[in-house]
Amino acid sequence: LPAQVAFTPYAPEPGGTCRLREYYDQTAQMCCSKCPPGQHAKVFCTKTSDTVCDSCEDSTYTQLWNWVPECLSCGSRCSSDQVETQACTREQNRICTCRPGWYCALSKQEGCRLCAQLRKCRPGFGVARPGTETSDVVCKPCAPGTFSNTTSSTDICRPHQICHVVAIPGNASMDAVCTSTSPTRSMAPGAVHLPQPVSTRSQHTQPTPAPSTAPGTSFLLPVGPSPPAEGSTGD
Protein backbone atom coordinates (compact mmCIF):
# COMPACT_ATOMS: atom_id res chain seq x y z
CA LEU A 1 0.00 0.00 0.00
CA PRO A 2 1.27 3.51 -0.75
CA ALA A 3 2.28 5.58 2.27
CA GLN A 4 -0.38 8.02 3.33
CA VAL A 5 0.30 11.67 2.50
CA ALA A 6 0.61 13.60 5.76
CA PHE A 7 -1.00 17.00 5.93
CA THR A 8 0.56 19.71 8.09
CA PRO A 9 0.76 19.80 10.99
CA TYR A 10 1.96 16.25 11.57
CA ALA A 11 4.43 14.54 13.87
CA PRO A 12 7.53 13.37 12.01
CA GLU A 13 8.75 9.80 12.22
CA PRO A 14 11.27 9.30 15.04
CA GLY A 15 14.60 10.58 13.74
CA GLY A 16 12.88 11.79 10.58
CA THR A 17 12.83 15.28 9.12
CA CYS A 18 10.13 17.52 7.77
CA ARG A 19 9.56 17.85 4.06
CA LEU A 20 10.55 20.63 1.71
CA ARG A 21 8.89 23.97 2.62
CA GLU A 22 8.09 22.70 6.09
CA TYR A 23 9.85 23.29 9.40
CA TYR A 24 9.87 21.54 12.74
CA ASP A 25 8.11 23.62 15.38
CA GLN A 26 9.76 22.97 18.74
CA THR A 27 6.76 24.12 20.76
CA ALA A 28 4.15 22.11 18.90
CA GLN A 29 6.63 19.29 18.15
CA MET A 30 5.11 19.04 14.70
CA CYS A 31 6.10 19.54 11.09
CA CYS A 32 4.42 22.76 9.96
CA SER A 33 4.19 24.75 6.74
CA LYS A 34 6.63 27.54 5.98
CA CYS A 35 5.37 30.79 4.50
CA PRO A 36 6.23 31.64 0.90
CA PRO A 37 8.43 34.61 -0.14
CA GLY A 38 6.52 37.85 0.36
CA GLN A 39 4.79 36.52 3.45
CA HIS A 40 5.60 35.84 7.10
CA ALA A 41 4.16 33.76 9.94
CA LYS A 42 1.29 35.65 11.49
CA VAL A 43 0.27 32.77 13.76
CA PHE A 44 2.54 29.85 14.52
CA CYS A 45 1.23 26.32 14.25
CA THR A 46 -0.12 24.21 17.06
CA LYS A 47 -0.72 20.47 17.31
CA THR A 48 -4.04 20.94 15.55
CA SER A 49 -3.65 24.00 13.31
CA ASP A 50 -1.09 24.92 10.67
CA THR A 51 0.96 28.10 10.32
CA VAL A 52 -1.10 31.16 9.35
CA CYS A 53 0.81 33.34 6.88
CA ASP A 54 0.23 36.98 6.04
CA SER A 55 1.59 39.35 3.38
CA CYS A 56 4.58 41.48 4.23
CA GLU A 57 3.72 44.97 5.41
CA ASP A 58 4.68 47.99 3.31
CA SER A 59 8.45 48.40 2.75
CA THR A 60 9.29 44.95 4.14
CA TYR A 61 10.12 41.69 2.42
CA THR A 62 10.98 38.01 2.74
CA GLN A 63 13.02 36.46 -0.04
CA LEU A 64 12.84 32.82 1.02
CA TRP A 65 10.34 30.32 2.37
CA ASN A 66 10.31 31.16 6.07
CA TRP A 67 8.57 31.15 9.40
CA VAL A 68 9.73 34.55 10.66
CA PRO A 69 7.22 36.50 12.79
CA GLU A 70 7.96 39.75 10.92
CA CYS A 71 9.24 40.49 7.43
CA LEU A 72 12.61 42.19 7.04
CA SER A 73 12.70 45.93 6.50
CA CYS A 74 13.81 47.14 3.07
CA GLY A 75 16.88 49.34 2.94
CA SER A 76 16.59 53.12 2.77
CA ARG A 77 15.75 54.90 -0.46
CA CYS A 78 18.77 55.25 -2.74
CA SER A 79 20.79 58.44 -2.33
CA SER A 80 21.32 60.98 -5.13
CA ASP A 81 24.66 59.44 -6.15
CA GLN A 82 23.01 56.03 -6.59
CA VAL A 83 20.52 54.34 -8.88
CA GLU A 84 17.91 51.84 -7.76
CA THR A 85 18.72 48.66 -9.67
CA GLN A 86 16.14 46.61 -7.78
CA ALA A 87 13.01 48.01 -6.16
CA CYS A 88 11.80 47.06 -2.71
CA THR A 89 8.99 44.55 -3.13
CA ARG A 90 7.40 42.02 -0.81
CA GLU A 91 9.88 39.43 -2.09
CA GLN A 92 13.12 41.35 -2.47
CA ASN A 93 15.13 44.09 -0.83
CA ARG A 94 15.97 47.34 -2.58
CA ILE A 95 19.39 47.36 -4.23
CA CYS A 96 21.22 50.63 -4.80
CA THR A 97 24.29 50.79 -7.02
CA CYS A 98 26.53 53.73 -7.87
CA ARG A 99 25.57 55.84 -10.84
CA PRO A 100 27.94 56.32 -13.81
CA GLY A 101 31.05 58.29 -12.82
CA TRP A 102 30.98 56.89 -9.27
CA TYR A 103 32.27 53.72 -7.63
CA CYS A 104 31.39 51.82 -4.48
CA ALA A 105 33.70 52.90 -1.66
CA LEU A 106 31.82 50.90 0.97
CA SER A 107 29.85 47.88 -0.14
CA LYS A 108 27.21 45.88 1.68
CA GLN A 109 25.82 42.41 1.16
CA GLU A 110 23.63 43.67 -1.68
CA GLY A 111 24.48 46.83 -3.57
CA CYS A 112 26.44 49.73 -2.15
CA ARG A 113 26.37 51.63 1.14
CA LEU A 114 28.60 54.55 0.10
CA CYS A 115 29.47 55.78 -3.38
CA ALA A 116 32.40 58.05 -4.21
CA GLN A 117 33.08 60.00 -7.36
CA LEU A 118 35.66 58.48 -9.70
CA ARG A 119 38.99 60.31 -9.67
CA LYS A 120 39.59 62.53 -12.70
CA CYS A 121 43.08 62.58 -14.15
CA ARG A 122 44.20 66.15 -14.79
CA PRO A 123 45.98 67.32 -17.97
CA GLY A 124 49.39 65.66 -18.26
CA PHE A 125 48.01 62.50 -16.65
CA GLY A 126 46.03 59.65 -18.15
CA VAL A 127 44.09 56.69 -16.85
CA ALA A 128 46.46 53.84 -15.97
CA ARG A 129 43.72 51.64 -14.53
CA PRO A 130 40.07 52.39 -15.19
CA GLY A 131 37.59 52.58 -12.36
CA THR A 132 35.45 49.57 -11.68
CA GLU A 133 32.25 49.04 -9.76
CA THR A 134 34.29 48.84 -6.56
CA SER A 135 37.63 50.58 -7.25
CA ASP A 136 38.76 54.09 -8.13
CA VAL A 137 40.60 55.23 -11.25
CA VAL A 138 44.40 55.14 -11.10
CA CYS A 139 46.18 57.97 -12.94
CA LYS A 140 49.75 58.03 -14.31
CA PRO A 141 51.87 60.80 -15.80
CA CYS A 142 51.89 60.76 -19.59
CA ALA A 143 55.12 59.23 -20.81
CA PRO A 144 57.36 61.11 -23.28
CA GLY A 145 55.67 61.17 -26.68
CA THR A 146 52.18 60.99 -25.22
CA PHE A 147 49.78 63.56 -23.81
CA SER A 148 46.39 64.14 -22.23
CA ASN A 149 44.86 67.60 -22.39
CA THR A 150 41.63 66.72 -20.53
CA THR A 151 40.43 66.36 -16.96
CA SER A 152 38.81 62.98 -17.23
CA SER A 153 38.15 59.70 -15.44
CA THR A 154 38.28 57.77 -18.72
CA ASP A 155 40.85 59.37 -21.05
CA ILE A 156 44.22 57.66 -21.50
CA CYS A 157 47.47 59.27 -22.62
CA ARG A 158 47.50 59.47 -26.42
CA PRO A 159 50.51 59.62 -28.71
CA HIS A 160 51.56 62.99 -30.09
CA GLN A 161 50.94 63.47 -33.75
CA ILE A 162 54.08 63.15 -35.81
CA CYS A 163 54.67 66.24 -37.89
CA HIS A 164 56.44 66.74 -41.20
CA VAL A 165 57.40 70.12 -39.75
CA VAL A 166 56.83 70.88 -36.06
CA ALA A 167 55.40 74.30 -35.18
CA ILE A 168 55.06 73.69 -31.43
CA PRO A 169 56.52 70.58 -29.81
CA GLY A 170 54.10 68.46 -27.82
CA ASN A 171 54.40 67.86 -24.09
CA ALA A 172 52.57 65.78 -21.50
CA SER A 173 49.48 68.00 -21.57
CA MET A 174 49.48 69.22 -25.16
CA ASP A 175 49.67 67.63 -28.56
CA ALA A 176 52.33 68.68 -31.03
CA VAL A 177 51.30 71.41 -33.45
CA CYS A 178 52.33 70.86 -37.05
CA THR A 179 52.91 73.38 -39.83
CA SER A 180 52.28 70.86 -42.59
CA THR A 181 48.76 70.17 -43.76
CA SER A 182 48.76 66.42 -43.24
CA PRO A 183 50.12 65.31 -39.88
CA THR A 184 50.34 61.62 -39.10
CA ARG A 185 49.18 60.09 -35.85
CA SER A 186 51.63 57.71 -34.23
CA MET A 187 49.79 54.64 -33.05
CA ALA A 188 52.44 52.44 -31.47
CA PRO A 189 56.21 51.95 -31.47
CA GLY A 190 57.44 50.93 -34.90
CA ALA A 191 54.00 51.23 -36.40
CA VAL A 192 54.57 54.46 -38.29
CA HIS A 193 55.95 54.25 -41.84
CA LEU A 194 56.17 57.60 -43.58
CA PRO A 195 57.01 57.98 -47.26
CA GLN A 196 59.40 60.88 -46.52
CA PRO A 197 61.61 61.84 -43.58
CA VAL A 198 60.08 63.76 -40.72
CA SER A 199 61.77 66.55 -38.81
CA THR A 200 63.41 65.27 -35.68
CA ARG A 201 62.83 66.74 -32.27
CA SER A 202 65.11 66.20 -29.33
CA GLN A 203 62.25 65.62 -26.92
CA HIS A 204 60.41 63.22 -29.19
CA THR A 205 61.00 59.63 -28.19
CA GLN A 206 58.96 56.66 -29.24
CA PRO A 207 55.53 56.89 -27.63
CA THR A 208 54.66 54.28 -25.03
CA PRO A 209 51.87 51.96 -26.07
CA ALA A 210 48.41 52.89 -24.91
CA PRO A 211 46.42 50.37 -22.83
CA SER A 212 44.90 47.81 -25.14
CA THR A 213 41.35 48.67 -24.18
CA ALA A 214 40.02 52.14 -23.61
CA PRO A 215 37.87 52.27 -20.49
CA GLY A 216 34.15 52.51 -21.11
CA THR A 217 31.22 52.57 -18.76
CA SER A 218 30.50 48.87 -18.80
CA PHE A 219 32.25 48.42 -15.47
CA LEU A 220 29.50 50.47 -13.89
CA LEU A 221 26.84 47.93 -14.70
CA PRO A 222 25.65 46.18 -11.55
CA VAL A 223 26.81 42.67 -10.88
CA GLY A 224 24.05 40.65 -9.23
CA PRO A 225 25.10 39.99 -5.64
CA SER A 226 24.01 36.92 -3.77
CA PRO A 227 20.81 37.40 -1.77
CA PRO A 228 20.98 37.65 2.01
CA ALA A 229 19.88 34.71 4.07
CA GLU A 230 17.08 35.35 6.51
CA GLY A 231 17.52 34.29 10.09
CA SER A 232 15.26 31.30 10.15
CA THR A 233 14.69 30.56 6.51
CA GLY A 234 15.80 28.08 3.91
CA ASP A 235 14.18 25.00 2.59
Partner: antibody, heavy 120, light 108 residues
Framework: QVQLVQSGSELKKPGASVKVSCKAS????????MHWVRQAPGQGLEWMGR????????KHDPKFQDKAVLSSDTSVSTAYLQISSLKAEDTAVYYC?????????????WGQGTLVTVSS | DIQMTQSPSSLSASVGDRVTITCTAS???????LHWYQQKPGSSPKLWIY???NLPSGVPSRFSGSGSGTDFTLTISSLQPEDFATYYC?????????FGQGTKVEIK
Protein backbone atom coordinates in the same frame (compact mmCIF):
# COMPACT_ATOMS: atom_id res chain seq x y z
CA GLN B 1 1.51 61.73 -15.67
CA VAL B 2 0.26 60.46 -12.31
CA GLN B 3 -3.21 61.71 -11.45
CA LEU B 4 -5.79 60.96 -8.76
CA VAL B 5 -9.19 62.40 -9.65
CA GLN B 6 -11.91 62.35 -7.01
CA SER B 7 -15.68 62.57 -7.33
CA GLY B 8 -17.49 65.85 -6.71
CA SER B 9 -18.80 67.49 -3.54
CA GLU B 10 -21.67 65.85 -1.66
CA LEU B 11 -24.38 67.27 0.59
CA LYS B 12 -25.90 64.61 2.84
CA LYS B 13 -28.41 64.41 5.68
CA PRO B 14 -27.44 62.97 9.08
CA GLY B 15 -27.77 59.17 9.14
CA ALA B 16 -27.21 58.83 5.40
CA SER B 17 -24.14 57.32 3.77
CA VAL B 18 -21.83 58.56 1.02
CA LYS B 19 -19.44 56.88 -1.42
CA VAL B 20 -16.43 58.89 -2.65
CA SER B 21 -14.41 57.66 -5.61
CA CYS B 22 -10.77 58.19 -6.56
CA LYS B 23 -9.75 57.35 -10.13
CA ALA B 24 -6.04 56.71 -10.67
CA SER B 25 -4.16 57.14 -13.92
CA UNK B 26 -0.57 57.30 -15.11
CA UNK B 27 0.80 54.44 -13.01
CA UNK B 28 0.49 50.74 -12.32
CA UNK B 29 -2.00 50.10 -9.54
CA UNK B 30 -0.19 46.92 -8.53
CA UNK B 31 2.58 48.14 -6.25
CA UNK B 32 0.86 50.94 -4.40
CA UNK B 33 -1.42 51.54 -1.45
CA MET B 34 -4.31 53.95 -1.61
CA HIS B 35 -4.92 55.95 1.56
CA TRP B 36 -7.84 58.03 2.68
CA VAL B 37 -7.18 61.13 4.79
CA ARG B 38 -9.79 63.53 6.07
CA GLN B 39 -9.59 67.18 7.03
CA ALA B 40 -12.40 68.84 8.93
CA PRO B 41 -12.87 72.59 8.30
CA GLY B 42 -9.95 74.52 9.80
CA GLN B 43 -8.45 71.32 11.22
CA GLY B 44 -5.45 69.11 10.54
CA LEU B 45 -5.01 65.89 8.57
CA GLU B 46 -6.40 62.64 9.92
CA TRP B 47 -5.47 59.25 8.44
CA MET B 48 -8.54 57.02 8.08
CA GLY B 49 -7.32 53.86 6.38
CA ARG B 50 -5.67 52.36 3.34
CA UNK B 51 -6.27 49.63 0.80
CA UNK B 52 -3.93 47.48 -1.24
CA UNK B 53 -5.76 47.49 -4.59
CA UNK B 54 -3.95 44.35 -5.76
CA UNK B 55 -5.25 42.19 -2.91
CA UNK B 56 -8.13 44.20 -1.46
CA UNK B 57 -6.47 44.07 1.98
CA UNK B 58 -7.40 47.05 4.13
CA LYS B 59 -6.12 48.66 7.31
CA HIS B 60 -8.05 51.26 9.32
CA ASP B 61 -7.53 53.61 12.18
CA PRO B 62 -9.71 51.82 14.79
CA LYS B 63 -11.64 55.07 15.15
CA PHE B 64 -12.97 54.60 11.61
CA GLN B 65 -13.25 50.80 11.58
CA ASP B 66 -17.04 50.73 11.76
CA LYS B 67 -17.55 54.03 9.95
CA ALA B 68 -15.54 53.68 6.75
CA VAL B 69 -15.47 50.90 4.18
CA LEU B 70 -12.59 50.91 1.71
CA SER B 71 -12.83 49.11 -1.60
CA SER B 72 -11.30 49.21 -5.05
CA ASP B 73 -12.03 48.10 -8.58
CA THR B 74 -8.77 47.49 -10.44
CA SER B 75 -10.59 47.09 -13.76
CA VAL B 76 -11.38 50.81 -13.68
CA SER B 77 -8.38 51.84 -11.53
CA THR B 78 -10.66 53.33 -8.91
CA ALA B 79 -10.63 53.27 -5.11
CA TYR B 80 -13.73 53.98 -3.04
CA LEU B 81 -14.46 55.27 0.44
CA GLN B 82 -17.93 54.65 1.82
CA ILE B 83 -18.89 56.43 5.03
CA SER B 84 -22.04 55.36 6.82
CA SER B 85 -24.23 56.83 9.59
CA LEU B 86 -23.10 60.34 8.74
CA LYS B 87 -23.07 62.95 11.49
CA ALA B 88 -22.45 66.70 11.36
CA GLU B 89 -18.89 66.08 12.61
CA ASP B 90 -18.17 64.00 9.49
CA THR B 91 -18.29 67.23 7.48
CA ALA B 92 -14.82 67.39 5.98
CA VAL B 93 -12.71 67.27 2.86
CA TYR B 94 -11.78 63.66 2.12
CA TYR B 95 -8.54 63.04 0.22
CA CYS B 96 -7.23 59.95 -1.45
CA UNK B 97 -3.45 59.64 -1.67
CA UNK B 98 -1.15 56.93 -2.94
CA UNK B 99 2.06 55.56 -1.48
CA UNK B 100 4.27 53.28 -3.58
CA UNK B 101 5.26 49.97 -1.99
CA UNK B 102 8.76 50.33 -0.57
CA UNK B 103 8.60 54.10 -0.06
CA UNK B 104 7.91 53.79 3.68
CA UNK B 105 4.42 55.23 3.40
CA UNK B 106 5.35 58.54 1.79
CA UNK B 107 2.17 59.74 0.06
CA UNK B 108 3.60 61.26 -3.10
CA UNK B 109 0.39 62.05 -5.01
CA TRP B 110 -2.93 63.29 -3.65
CA GLY B 111 -6.39 63.71 -5.12
CA GLN B 112 -7.96 67.17 -5.25
CA GLY B 113 -10.24 66.32 -2.31
CA THR B 114 -13.98 65.76 -2.01
CA LEU B 115 -16.00 67.98 0.29
CA VAL B 116 -18.71 66.07 2.14
CA THR B 117 -21.16 68.30 4.00
CA VAL B 118 -23.54 66.73 6.49
CA SER B 119 -26.44 68.97 7.37
CA SER B 120 -30.11 68.61 8.07
CA ASP C 1 -1.13 54.98 18.88
CA ILE C 2 1.92 57.13 18.28
CA GLN C 3 1.06 60.78 18.96
CA MET C 4 2.89 63.38 16.87
CA THR C 5 3.19 66.81 18.47
CA GLN C 6 4.40 69.76 16.43
CA SER C 7 5.74 72.98 17.81
CA PRO C 8 5.01 75.74 17.45
CA SER C 9 1.41 75.43 16.28
CA SER C 10 1.88 78.65 14.35
CA LEU C 11 4.65 81.15 13.80
CA SER C 12 5.03 84.56 12.18
CA ALA C 13 8.23 85.17 10.27
CA SER C 14 9.66 87.51 7.66
CA VAL C 15 11.06 86.73 4.24
CA GLY C 16 14.70 85.72 4.64
CA ASP C 17 14.25 84.35 8.19
CA ARG C 18 15.49 80.93 9.22
CA VAL C 19 12.55 78.85 10.42
CA THR C 20 12.62 75.58 12.38
CA ILE C 21 9.58 73.39 13.05
CA THR C 22 9.87 70.46 15.43
CA CYS C 23 7.88 67.24 15.58
CA THR C 24 8.00 65.05 18.66
CA ALA C 25 6.73 61.46 18.60
CA SER C 26 5.30 59.79 21.70
CA UNK C 27 7.46 56.74 20.95
CA UNK C 28 10.42 56.07 18.71
CA UNK C 29 9.93 56.27 14.94
CA UNK C 30 12.39 54.88 12.39
CA UNK C 31 13.76 57.77 10.32
CA UNK C 32 12.70 56.03 7.09
CA UNK C 33 9.06 56.32 8.17
CA LEU C 34 8.92 60.04 9.04
CA HIS C 35 7.61 62.41 6.37
CA TRP C 36 6.58 66.07 6.06
CA TYR C 37 3.79 67.58 3.95
CA GLN C 38 3.12 71.16 2.90
CA GLN C 39 -0.45 72.40 2.46
CA LYS C 40 -1.64 75.76 1.21
CA PRO C 41 -5.24 77.00 1.75
CA GLY C 42 -7.69 75.42 -0.67
CA SER C 43 -5.12 72.92 -1.98
CA SER C 44 -4.27 69.30 -1.37
CA PRO C 45 -1.23 68.47 0.77
CA LYS C 46 2.06 67.86 -1.04
CA LEU C 47 4.85 65.52 0.00
CA TRP C 48 7.61 67.93 1.04
CA ILE C 49 10.26 65.83 2.79
CA TYR C 50 10.35 62.03 2.85
CA UNK C 51 12.22 59.65 5.15
CA UNK C 52 13.29 62.47 7.52
CA UNK C 53 15.73 64.27 5.24
CA ASN C 54 15.07 63.64 1.54
CA LEU C 55 13.57 66.24 -0.78
CA PRO C 56 11.30 65.17 -3.65
CA SER C 57 12.11 66.80 -6.97
CA GLY C 58 10.73 70.32 -7.15
CA VAL C 59 11.19 71.10 -3.45
CA PRO C 60 13.72 73.94 -3.02
CA SER C 61 17.05 73.12 -1.37
CA ARG C 62 16.46 75.76 1.31
CA PHE C 63 14.28 73.10 2.96
CA SER C 64 15.99 70.43 5.02
CA GLY C 65 14.94 67.78 7.50
CA SER C 66 16.76 65.97 10.28
CA GLY C 67 16.23 63.97 13.43
CA SER C 68 15.93 60.47 14.80
CA GLY C 69 14.09 58.52 17.49
CA THR C 70 11.38 60.81 18.81
CA ASP C 71 12.61 64.25 17.71
CA PHE C 72 12.49 65.51 14.14
CA THR C 73 12.84 68.94 12.58
CA LEU C 74 12.01 70.71 9.33
CA THR C 75 14.17 73.78 8.65
CA ILE C 76 13.77 76.56 6.08
CA SER C 77 17.14 78.29 5.79
CA SER C 78 15.79 81.49 4.21
CA LEU C 79 12.02 81.88 4.16
CA GLN C 80 10.52 82.87 0.79
CA PRO C 81 7.02 84.23 0.06
CA GLU C 82 5.91 80.90 -1.47
CA ASP C 83 6.84 79.03 1.75
CA PHE C 84 3.95 80.48 3.76
CA ALA C 85 1.78 77.41 4.35
CA THR C 86 0.95 74.74 6.92
CA TYR C 87 3.43 71.91 7.45
CA TYR C 88 2.48 68.49 8.82
CA CYS C 89 4.74 65.69 10.04
CA UNK C 90 3.54 62.13 9.55
CA UNK C 91 4.69 58.80 10.98
CA UNK C 92 4.24 55.53 9.11
CA UNK C 93 6.18 53.51 11.64
CA UNK C 94 3.24 51.91 13.40
CA UNK C 95 -0.44 51.69 12.51
CA UNK C 96 -2.60 53.67 12.92
CA UNK C 97 -0.44 56.11 11.01
CA UNK C 98 -0.71 59.58 12.41
CA PHE C 99 -0.07 63.22 11.51
CA GLY C 100 1.06 66.08 13.68
CA GLN C 101 -1.53 68.82 14.27
CA GLY C 102 0.27 71.10 11.80
CA THR C 103 2.40 74.24 12.02
CA LYS C 104 1.10 77.31 10.21
CA VAL C 105 3.86 79.59 8.91
CA GLU C 106 2.48 83.12 8.48
CA ILE C 107 3.88 86.40 7.20
CA LYS C 108 4.97 88.79 9.94
Amino acid sequence: QVQLVQSGSELKKPGASVKVSCKASGFNNKDIYMHWVRQAPGQGLEWMGRIDPATGNTKHDPKFQDKAVLSSDTSVSTAYLQISSLKAEDTAVYYCARSPYGDFGAMDYWGQGTLVTVSS
Amino acid sequence: DIQMTQSPSSLSASVGDRVTITCTASSSVSSNYLHWYQQKPGSSPKLWIYSTSNLPSGVPSRFSGSGSGTDFTLTISSLQPEDFATYYCHQYHRSPWTFGQGTKVEIK
